[in-house]
């Protein structure tokens, strides 16, 4: 259980402000499942405040990891029968300490709300809720106070002076004298061979066995060849099952081992530590982490959770590292900001995912009939007659560079230019001298100055203006 900055939300910050040390308190409020979460209705089912909270002394400039929550449980006494479906509201409050605190002593840091379905007497349910920049990890369960028993705490098991049929330590239930109070039941999955319990929802291991469900043999040096001791000195056995052996995930869930325990990936329609909770509708609020529930008006129709960015799973219960999907192209650096993804592009690339190469022709249009030409790691527009500029958007004066040789007169034309040559010269650019004796015309301009190439002219014109 912890309260702290969520992953991808920047440098973790302290809940305390500059005015010195502070304490965190948690207010838990229970509302009927039918109430609207957004309304400030009364905590009709009950409310409670955490106690014995530690003091945090971090200052705003320091880095603060997730804060461990106090060991003490927050007990919320509820009135009447346990409804099963309810709204759970958890508020995180900061109390400023010190003589010079000044200003308000109490501030609401975060408030998470969710609708849940939970039977009394069941195991701890785990949850992660995020609001703003804070993330709260917590567990919750509902338990009946004697003499109440049952999933709704609606049956009473009262002691009687006469001996009952229930056996020592167990009482008959009124108004159901034929029923007895529920026994102390071990945590689901506790090994029937190697585990037992004396308190509900625990799993104690017999000698030679360990693990959260007592399925892991204790290794000792007296057993050789990878074998382990059996129970009650029964000799050495082959290693026992791991946390996922026997697949603790129900309803088609898939199991993965996590530091000696297990984690279930549940199919749609199921959730819970072991995918054991089913038949839920959108009214039960099955979508975690702000997921939007669609469909599932009745238990027989499936609901779908539309998860916010950064979460996945059939109930939006799993945080996903979206950068692991490598969304940034062309070597861009991925940044998961929590509320959005950002790509920091390498030089020469642009776009939300760095998908645009600024130095290639893909997706780059040259205006006015120009064509894109790649070369040497760069791109340029080869413009049609009469246009210039980087993207051929500028109108060009074809006569500006005096393309007509030997005093020829230049006339701009819609298709380019026309040279009117001086007497004794001919050619498109008046580049040939006419010999009176009928000899062949010879070039009058040096070789290589192909001024008649309007594209080259415009290309140079482009560079001239930039």
């Amino acid at each position: 259980h912890s309260f702290g900055p969520g992953p991808g939300l920047g440098t973790p910050r302290s809940p305390c402000n500059a005015r010195g040390p502070c304490r965190l308190f948690f207010r838990v409020c229970l509302k009927p499942g039918v109430s609207q979460e957004a309304t400030e209705s009364l905590c009709a089912l009950g409310a409670a405040l955490s106690t014995s909270v530690p003091v945090y002394t971090e200052h705003p400039g320091e880095s603060a990891a997730a804060l461990p929550l106090p060991d003490g449980l927050v007990r919320v006494p509820f009135r009447d029968a346990w409804p099963g479906t309810f709204s759970l509201v958890i508020e995180t409050w900061r109390e400023q300490l010190g003589e010079h605190a000044g200003g308000p002593a109490w501030n609401l840091l975060a408030r998470v709300v969710g609708r849940r379905r939970l039977a009394a007497g069941g195991p701890w349910a785990r949850d992660v809720q995020r609001t703003g920049t804070w993330e709260l990890h917590f567990s919750y369960r509902a338990r009946c106070e004697p003499p109440a028993v049952g999933a709704a705490c609606a049956r009473l098991c009262r002691s009687r002076s006469a001996p009952s049929r229930c056996g020592p330590g167990l009482r008959p239930c009124t108004p159901f004298p034929d029923e007895c109070e529920a026994p102390s039941v071990c945590r689901p999955g506790c090994s029937p061979e190697h585990g037992y319990c004396e308190e509900p929802d625990e799993c104690r291991c017999l000698e030679g066995w360990t693990g959260p469900l007592c399925t892991v043999p204790v290794s000792t040096s007296s057993c050789l060849n990878s074998r382990v001791p059996g129970p009650a000195s029964t000799g050495c056995l082959l290693p026992g099952p791991g946390p996922c052996d026997g697949n603790p995930c129900a309803n088609g869930g898939s199991c993965s081992e996590t530091s000696g325990s297990f984690e279930c990936a549940c199919p749609r329609g199921f959730y819970g530590l072991r995918c054991e909770v089913s038949g839920v509708t959108c009214a039960d609020g099955p979508c975690f982490n702000g997921g939007l529930c669609v469909g599932g008006e009745d238990p027989d129709s499936a609901y779908v959770c539309h998860c916010p960015p950064g979460f996945q799973g059939s109930n939006c219960e799993k945080r996903v590292d979206r950068c692991s999907l490598q969304p940034c192209q062309n070597g861009g650096l991925c940044l998961d900001l929590g509320h959005a993804l950002r790509c920091r592009c390498r030089a020469g690339f642009a776009g939300p995912r760095c998908e645009h190469d600024l130095d290639d022709c893909a997706g780059r249009a040259c205006a006015n009939g120009g064509t894109c030409v790649e070369g040497g790691g760069s791109r340029r527009c080869s413009c049609a007659l009469g246009f210039g500029g980087r993207d051929c958007r500028e109108r060009a004066d074809p006569c500006a560079s005096r393309p007509c040789a030997h005093g020829g007169r230049c006339y701009a034309h819609f298709s380019g230019l026309v040279c009117a040559c001086a007497p004794g010269y001919m050619g498109v650019r008046c580049e040939f001298a006419v010999r009176p004796d009928g000899a062949d015309a010879v070039p009058a301009a040096p070789r290589g100055l192909r001024q008649a190439d309007p594209q080259r002219f415009l290309h140079h014109h482009h560079h001239h203006h930039h």
Epitope: A119, G121, G122, A151, C166, G167, P168, G169, L170, E179, C180, E181, A182, P183, S184, V185, C186, P188, G189, C190, S191, P192, E193, H194, G195, Y196, C197, E198, P200, E202, R204, L206, E207, P231, A232, T234, N247, P248, C249, A250, N251, R274, E276
Partner: antibody, heavy 120, light 107 residues
Framework: QITLKESGPTLVKPTQTLTLTCTFS??????????VGWIRQPPGKALEWLAL???????RYSPSLQTRLTITKDTPKNQVVLTMTNMDPVDTATYYC????????????WGRGTLVTVSS | EIVLTQSPATLSLSPGERATLSCRAS??????LAWYQQKPGQAPRLLIY???YRATGIPARFSGSGSGTDFTLTISSLEPEDFAVYYC?????????FGQGTRLEIK
């Protein structure tokens, strides 16, 4: 290796008392959390839980048979004894003993069973 | 007491087929339900406990699901040795009770 074995009469007369013994090895009823129970099965019918006893001498009985049943243990001998009074032909069944841990009310390890016939 | 009702009473299938056995509780037993297999002349053997945990040495073709009042034992591909009687049992409260059994026979 954990084993459990039932023993007792194969035939009893109506109104008599049946005494069955479960002798086990591989574990001890002095171990915290460990218990031994009895389950019976009439021929061709379903299983029926009868009684349980645990290391701390805590006993549990089926409500429908509680007045007729007594379960005891002899820890040093690794034995559990079930007595059932006022036997009737409908009590004809195979009687099994099995191990069950406290709070984990399943039966992970069973004996082979002994058939008891109630007939005059 | 909690009554466990198993269905069908008899299920006739061939080896290699998929078997689905049902157990329904008269009131919620959470996930505190086990499945046993019993072959003729033998004691029952624990297959599944707490609805979906396989007991030691049980093949992966056996799987359990469900919670509350409705539970299912599935055998993904029947082997010849799987034809037997199957019982469910709860540990939700006292008294412990068993279902009446489902006989799985070769078709």
């Amino acid at each position: 290796q954990i084993t459990l074995k039932e023993s007792g009469p194969t035939l009893v007369k109506p109104t008599q008392t049946l005494t069955l013994t479960c002798t086990f090895s591989g574990f001890s009823l002095s171990t915290r959390g460990v218990g031994v129970g009895w389950i019976r099965q009439p021929p061709g019918k379903a299983l029926e839980w009868l009684a349980l006893i645990y290391w701390n001498d805590d006993k549990r009985y089926s409500p429908s048979l509680q007045t007729r049943l007594t379960i005891t243990k002899d820890t040093p001998k690794n034995q559990v004894v079930l007595t059932m009074t006022n036997m009737d032909p409908v009590d004809t069944a195979t009687y099994y003993c099995a191990r069950s841990n406290w709070g984990n009310w399943y039966f992970a390890l069973w004996g082979r069973g002994t058939l008891v016939t109630v007939s005059s | 007491e909690i009554v466990l009702t198993q269905s069908p009473a008899t299920l006739s299938l061939s080896p290699g087929e998929r078997a689905t056995l049902s157990c329904r509780a008269s009131q919620s037993v959470s996930s505190y339900l086990a499945w046993y297999q019993q072959k003729p002349g033998q004691a029952p053997r624990l297959l599944i406990y707490d609805a979906f945990y396989r007991a030691t040495g049980i093949p992966a073709r056996f799987s359990g699901s469900g919670s509350g009042t409705d539970f299912t034992l599935t055998i993904s591909s029947l082997e010849p040795e799987d034809f037997a009687v199957y019982y469910c049992q709860h540990r939700s409260n006292w008294p412990i009770t068993f279902g009446q059994g489902t006989r799985l026979e070769i078709k």
